[in-house]
Interface confidence: low
């Protein structure tokens, strides 16, 4: 099965903190078609559960194998079906998560139900807020069944589905008649394509016997393991707080997997992480229980103790799920559940066994998927175990599949199946991409699409001057980083090729196609200095500069002047395209502003050293501040402002600007124009009741003038929350969640 997990954060006190994350453990997942494979898709599926339109959700990609959905503004945004799609080609897989509103009238006792073909499925909706009306059950959005409200059993409405078949799969819902659909209980029914313990096209093959709540995939017979378990049969527990097919992922946050729902490819569905349970996965397992949703009971024997994440921890001398097996029966030890080798390699596989009587070399054998039995070439005998070593013939793709190590002694026998994945070394399909160039270096992106298998462990970049017969230079780089080729010759063409490797012996792939990259012209080295400047108006500045005298031609195409307005955090750049220029006029500057000024020489796209900076203050413009600003509350949503015109005006006022801000608020202030300059009062409407506001104002002639003093006033009474301050009233609309 594809290693794809959809995590839902269920700490639902605030919908804005809710997020969904899709994590792929697949090699090179999610980087898009121009890199390692098709991207991960994470979206809300509104086909069955439709919710009111709201602001679009925000999708953020975190690295190559993770995508997160945020931006939920109200509880109703969360309700419904979400899906993540990952994996490439025939392995493309959709993982589904169904979210129920915690405040719904009806709540599912269990959201995901995985059943076998021919089973009876029972969906149970618990009454959360009782209504004395019929309950309507729907399947994939279509009417299915009605129950009278008197038919509730122990506060639950049950839907029994006998003899289910794969087409019965889908989203089921239970809703009170006349109630909002958002108050429904939503369920997901997954019907495996085979009866219990079977898989394959005709359901003729036997499942491996998935442990710890793992579910046998009806197409490929692999166990889809619950979060927190790994191995061919889910026999191995991950360390606390880890998940993914190889336990390679870690739950975010300090409280580990608490409050997270995990959804995995069908036929598993969704559950809490190992050690957690409850509708929001925030409750620890009860004593004696462990695993995902705490569904498993330890029942440890022979002095074993129960760990809520991993199950029975056995004392010395015992093993097995319940510590029921004596160490005297032969036992395969520490066999990896999955091994990976590269095509055409001849690996050595070790299989260790212990027991009494002690296993010898001939008692351990290795069986390939095609039934071929390999005998060990040598055995290492230690006091506590025998390790048999098998030399495997050159691997072909057909060797992928389940291998088995078997030990037989007079004390009994044991076998351990493990999966062997034969991988094809990666070969680049395209040439590397030039990102930036300088006179003596090239910055190259080696990430290209490739044939074969990931993950990419190393990237080798081979390069040499064009048309050269000299040896290639090689640089080994991290697959996720751009490469800088250094100490090159200026204005020279280089042939560059990529070679990719995957982990393991024989993982190096063939070289990719070459590309030509040319270094830039030399960088300018001269540092100018500012000779002087003078102000030619409130928004104009004349600047002059000099260069040191050096022999030879000037290396440069022109000058770049930079003005930095620190108050506003803005930079202005002026290009002077002649290398002979030594003066420039800068216009359109902001009056009354303190600028930091410098100049530097440029050549091609390269900048030389900047001159020492100069500090310039432009004279201010604009009218003086309005006088005697006063605020008076009129009602629970209106405040009147009064003021006196500024004195000594340089011209007629075009308008006033009022700034409104909630006292102590962190948001941006709101500016409101008063377009009748003869006025000396205005009423600000649409304010929130019982709220303290700050006001100040300024006049505008051609430019904005100085701010007045700030005044503070509170609205009266207790009323509805308004939409925001305006000068004319606007009716407040009641939101969905109000």
């Amino acid at each position: 099965a594809v290693d794809l997990t959809l995590l839902a954060n269920l700490r639902l006190t605030d919908p804005q903190r809710f997020f969904l994350t899709c994590v792929s453990g697949e090699a090179g997942a999610g980087r898009g078609s121009d890199a390692w494979g098709p991207p991960l898709l994470l979206e809300k599926d509104d086909r069955i559960v439709r919710t009111p339109p709201g602001p679009p959700l925000r999708l953020a990609r975190n690295g190559s194998h993770q995508v997160t959905l945020r931006g939920f503004s109200k509880p109703s945004d969360l309700v419904g079906v979400f899906s993540c799609v990952g994996g490439a080609g025939a392995r493309r897989t959709r993982v589904i998560y169904v979210h129920n509103s915690p405040g719904a009238h009806l709540l599912p006792d269990k959201v995901t139900h995985t059943v076998n073909k021919g089973d009876t499925a029972v969906l149970s909706a618990r009454v959360h807020k009782e209504k004395q009306t019929d309950v309507i059950w729907k399947s994939n959005g279509s009417y299915f069944y009605t129950l009278d409200w008197h038919e509730a059993q122990d506060g639950r409405f049950l839907l029994q589905l006998p003899n289910v078949q794969p087409p019965s799969s889908g989203i089921y819902s239970a809703t009170y008649l006349e109630a909002s659909p958002l108050g429904s209980a939503f369920f997901r029914l997954i019907v495996r394509g085979c009866g219990a313990g079977r898989w394959g096209p005709g359901c003729t093959k036997e499942c491996p016997g998935c442990l710890h709540g793992g579910v046998c995939h009806d197409h490929d017979g692999e166990c889809v393991c619950p979060p927190g378990f790994t191995g061919t049969r889910c026999e191995q527990a991950c360390r606390e707080g880890r998940f993914g097919q190889s336990c390679q992922e870690q739950c975010p946050g300090i409280s580990g997997c608490r409050g997270l729902t995990f959804c995995l490819p069908d036929p598993y569905g969704c559950s809490c992480g190992s050690g957690w349970r409850g509708s929001q996965c925030q409750e620890a397992c009860a004593p004696g229980h462990f695993g995902a949703d705490c569904r498993l009971q330890c029942q440890c024997q022979n002095g074993g103790t129960c760990d809520r994440f991993s199950g029975c921890v056995c004392p010395s001398g015992w093993h097995g799920v319940h510590c029921e097996k004596s160490d005297r029966i032969p036992q395969i030890l520490n066999m990896a559940s999955e091994l990976e080798f590269n095509l055409e390699t001849m690996p050595r596989i070790n299989c260790a066994a212990a027991g009494n009587p002690f296993p010898v070399r001939g008692s351990i054998e290795l069986r390939k998927p095609d039934g071929t039995v390999l005998l060990s070439t040598k055995a290492i005998v230690e006091p506590e175990k025998t390790t048999a070593e098998f030399e495997v013939p050159r691997l072909v793709l057909a060797d992928s599949g389940f291998w088995e190590c078997r030990v037989s002694t007079s004390g009994g026998q044991d076998s351990r199946r493990f999966k062997v994945n034969v991988k094809v070394p990666p070969v680049p399909l395209a040439a590397p991409r030039l990102l930036t160039k300088q006179s003596r270096q090239l910055v190259v992106s080696p990430l290209v699409s490739f044939s074969g298998d990931g993950p990419i462990s190393t990237v080798r970049l081979h390069y040499r001057p064009q048309d050269s017969t000299m040896d290639w230079s090689t640089i080994v780089v991290d697959p996720s980083e751009n490469v800088t080729l250094m100490n090159l010759r200026p204005k020279t063409g280089y042939s560059v090729r990529v070679q990719l490797s995957r982990p393991g012996e024989g993982g190096e792939g063939a070289w990719g196609p070459p590309t030509l990259m040319t270094t830039d012209c030399p960088e300018p080295l001269l540092q100018p200095w500012l000779e002087g400047w003078h102000v030619e108006g409130t928004d104009r500045l004349r600047v002059s500069w000099s260069l040191p005298l050096v022999p030879g031609p000037l290396v440069g195409d022109g000058f770049l002047l930079r003005l930095w307005d620190g108050t506003r955090g803005q930079e202005r750049r002026e290009n002077v395209s002649s290398p002979q220029a030594r003066t420039a006029l800068l216009t359109g500057l902001t009056p009354g502003t303190h600028y930091q000024l410098d100049v530097q020489l440029y050549h091609c796209t390269l900048l030389g050293p900047a001159s020492p900076p100069a500090h310039v203050l432009l004279p201010p413009s604009g009218p003086p501040a309005p006088r005697h600003l006063h605020a008076q509350a009129l009602s629970d949503s209106e405040i009147q402002l009064t003021w006196k015109h500024p004195e000594a005006l340089p011209g007629p006022i075009s308008k006033y600007v009022v700034e409104v801000q909630v006292a102590g608020g962190a948001g941006d202030p709101l500016w409101i124009d008063v377009d009748r300059p003869e006025e000396t009062s205005t009423i600000i409407r649409g304010l929130n009741a019982s709220t303290r506001y700050l006001f100040r104002m300024r006049a505008s002639i051609q430019g904005l003038g100085d701010w007045s003093n700030t005044v503070e006033e509170s609205t009266l009474g207790n009323g509805l929350q308004a939409e925001g301050p305006v000068q004319e009233s606007r009716a407040a609309e009641e939101g969905l969640d109000q």
Epitope: T13, G155, R258, Q282, E283, A284
Partner: antibody, heavy 126, light 107 residues
Framework: EVQLLESGGGLVQPGGSLRLSCAAS????????MGWVRQAPGKGLEWVSR????????KYADSVKGRFTISRDNSKNTLYLQMNSLRAEDTAVYYC???FGPGDLWSGYYDAFDIWGQGTMVTVSS | QSALTQDPAVSVALGQTVRFTCQGD??????PSWYQQKPGQAPVLVIY???NRPSGIPDRFSGSSSGNTASLTITGAQAEDEADYYC??????????FGTGTKVTVL
């Protein structure tokens, strides 16, 4: 070792106030519901109050509603019970207990106090 | 708040079986938990959920429930089982409620 240790009990006059504390150790306090249960001399157990892991949701018995306040400090692994306007009928041993309900579909819906403190005596008398 | 009603007292011969009940509306939705309390000691949880025992509780204790009635059974009572037993559940408003208690005497 999983442990709950109450403190703060004692003799107080009617109308007075008292604050009980319960220090938790040996388990992840912040993920469990916690509660207070009392037992008057020679009487049965009486549930007093409980609080959810975040501390944002609290429940009270009718007999103490409006007078008692349950709270918790997850950073200190401590549960509190602030008792105001105390009456003679509040005289009891007060136990702090860990609540690991409300169960699930497999083991049934329930609420259970699986860990109890040794109790602290509160006497309200003039 | 709703109450849970228990048998006030029961007695059982050593090694025999005793069953006592707990009745109340909240038991329709919630399984009770059962506690054993010996004089001068804090209560100890013996059964929770459908019929779950915490580790360290002997398997002679078992629980069952149907409708609004639940029961605790001690199969093969021992002298150390002599104690007060309380049932506890949760009502519709999320409050806990304890039963009135049953005094068990082992003869």
């Amino acid at each position: 070792e999983v442990q709950l240790l109450e403190s703060g009990g004692g003799l107080v006059q009617p109308g007075g106030s008292l604050r009980l504390s319960c220090a938790a150790s040996g388990f992840t306090f912040s993920i469990y519901q916690m509660g207070w249960v009392r037992q008057a001399p020679g009487k049965g157990l009486e549930w007093v109050s409980r609080i959810y892991p975040s501390g944002g949701v609290t429940k009270y018995a009718d007999s103490v509603k409006g007078r008692f306040t349950i709270s918790r400090d997850n950073s200190k692994n401590t549960l509190y019970l602030q008792m105001n306007s105390l009456r003679a009928e509040d005289t009891a041993v007060y136990y702090c207990a860990r609540d690991f309900g409300p169960g699930d579909l497999w083991s049934g819906y329930y609420d259970a106090f699986d860990i109890w403190g040794q109790g602290t005596m509160v006497t309200v008398s003039s | 708040q709703s109450a849970l009603t228990q048998d006030p007292a029961v007695s059982v011969a050593l090694g025999q079986t005793v069953r006592f009940t707990c009745q109340g509306d909240s038991l329709r939705n919630y399984h009770p938990s059962w506690y054993q309390q010996k004089p001068g000691q804090a209560p100890v949880l013996v059964i929770y959920g459908k019929n779950n025992r915490p580790s360290g509780i002997p398997d002679r204790f078992s629980g069952s429930s149907s409708g609004n009635t639940a029961s605790l059974t001690i199969t093969g009572a021992q002298a150390e089982d002599e104690a007060d037993y309380y049932c506890n559940s949760r009502d519709s408003s999320g409050n806990h409620v304890f039963g009135t208690g049953t005094k068990v005497t082992v003869l």
